[in-house]
Amino acid sequence: PRSIDVKYIGVKSAYVSYDVQKRTIYLNITNTLNITNNNYYSVEVENITAQVQFAKTVIGKARLNNITHIGPLDMKQIDYTVPTVIAEEMSYMYDFCTLISIKVHNIVLMMQVTVTTTYFGHSEQISQERYQYVDCGRNTTYQLGQSEYLNVLQPQQ
């Protein structure tokens, strides 16, 4: 068998809402993956599991099942959404994200994704992780790759 390549492209959109009384931020983050099947037979994308971390704390998880199949030597682009919650124990983030004096409220999130593919009863898992900027102060649609956090070092939170 040849490889199945998974490429995390980036954040496609981030939609924000707030619970003012609980000082909580809700971010629905839609991400884009490219999955390439380099084989001469079809493969099934059985599931995608994703999680988002902020300051080493998991703030959101998602799982998609029975997603699609990819034909021989074909590529599919898949969008998946992770609902995240930055809650009261990080209330300084609510203060930051709702502070209008700051024009761009970029926070650094670590996106982790694992894709499980199957072919002829064989299962394979491929994982990726990437730091991304997301604006927690407004709804944002990104051009693919625009939100990438380029610092290779662990960012300070």
Partner: antibody, heavy 117, light 112 residues
Framework: EVQLVESGGGLVKPGGSLKLSCAAS????????MSWVRETPEKRLEWVAF????????YYADNVKDRFTISRDNAKNNLYLQMRHLKSEDTAMYYC??????????WGQGTLVTVSV | DIVMTQAAFSNPVTLGTSASISCRSS???????????LFWYLQKPGQSPQLLIY???NLASGVPDRFSSSGSGTDFTLRISRVEAEDVGVYYC?????????FGGGTKLEIK
């Protein structure tokens, strides 16, 4: 316990300079924006200057622009207000306040600046 | 600049009864994110101001629930349900929607 302690106020002649300091403790200073607010002798409150958590955004009230400079040292948990070309109308009690989307959540006790001949 | 307007004095109130303090802004303080950027502060005699209400209607930490606030985008009311002696002072409304942040002139709570 969150504490903000201002210092550096005093009596200064018109045209003179002063540097106010605000020592912060009891919270992660580098996570928060800060502002200076003053209370005039007529008991009016006026916002003076703002600085974001990392210092990337700085704003001033029109009547102090080009005369006052706000800065911060996150390593020392200190906020500063350098005041130059002081005028009699700058006479006030100056407060530092922790700023954010939820308002000025904490205030210092204030330091009095008197500009007079 | 956004102008915040308050009456200088409240109607004198008897301890244990309710009081209302009004504030008006020259522009709507409702942001597109759904939050209204109106805040209430109390400055007690000889003290620094303290936050009472954030984002129009939310009680700040440690503030008794005798205090409440409501309003539209431009007209706001702070209510004290059972006035106590310790509530005496000057109440300021503030907008944090736009720079410069602007304060109302303050309303002094008068006790009969």
């Amino acid at each position: 316990e969150v504490q903000l302690v201002e210092s550096g106020g005093g009596l200064v002649k018109p045209g003179g300079s002063l540097k106010l300091s605000c020592a912060a403790s009891g919270f992660t200073f580098s996570n928060y924006a800060m502002s200076w607010v003053r209370e005039t002798p007529e008991k009016r409150l006026e916002w003076v200057a703002f600085i974001s958590d990392g210092g990337g955004y700085i704003y001033y009230a029109d009547n102090v622009k080009d005369r006052f400079t706000i800065s911060r040292d996150n390593a020392k948990n200190n906020l500063y207000l350098q005041m130059r070309h002081l005028k009699s109308e700058d006479t006030a009690m100056y407060y530092c306040a922790r700023d954010g989307g939820t308002g000025f959540t904490y205030w210092g006790q204030g330091t009095l600046v008197t500009v007079s001949v | 600049d956004i102008v915040m307007t308050q009456a200088a004095f409240s109607n004198p109130v008897t301890l244990g009864t309710s009081a209302s303090i009004s504030c008006r802004s020259s522009k709507s303080l409702l942001h597109s994110n759904g939050i209204t950027y109106l805040f209430w502060y109390l400055q007690k005699p000889g003290q620094s101001p303290q936050l009472l209400i954030y984002q129009m209607s939310n009680l700040a930490s440690g503030v008794p629930d005798r205090f409440s606030s409501s309003g539209s985008g431009t007209d706001f009311t702070l209510r004290i349900s059972r006035v106590e002696a310790e509530d005496v002072g000057v109440y300021y409304c503030v907008q944090n929607l736009e720079l410069p942040y602007t304060f109302g002139g303050g309303t002094k709570l008068e006790i009969k």
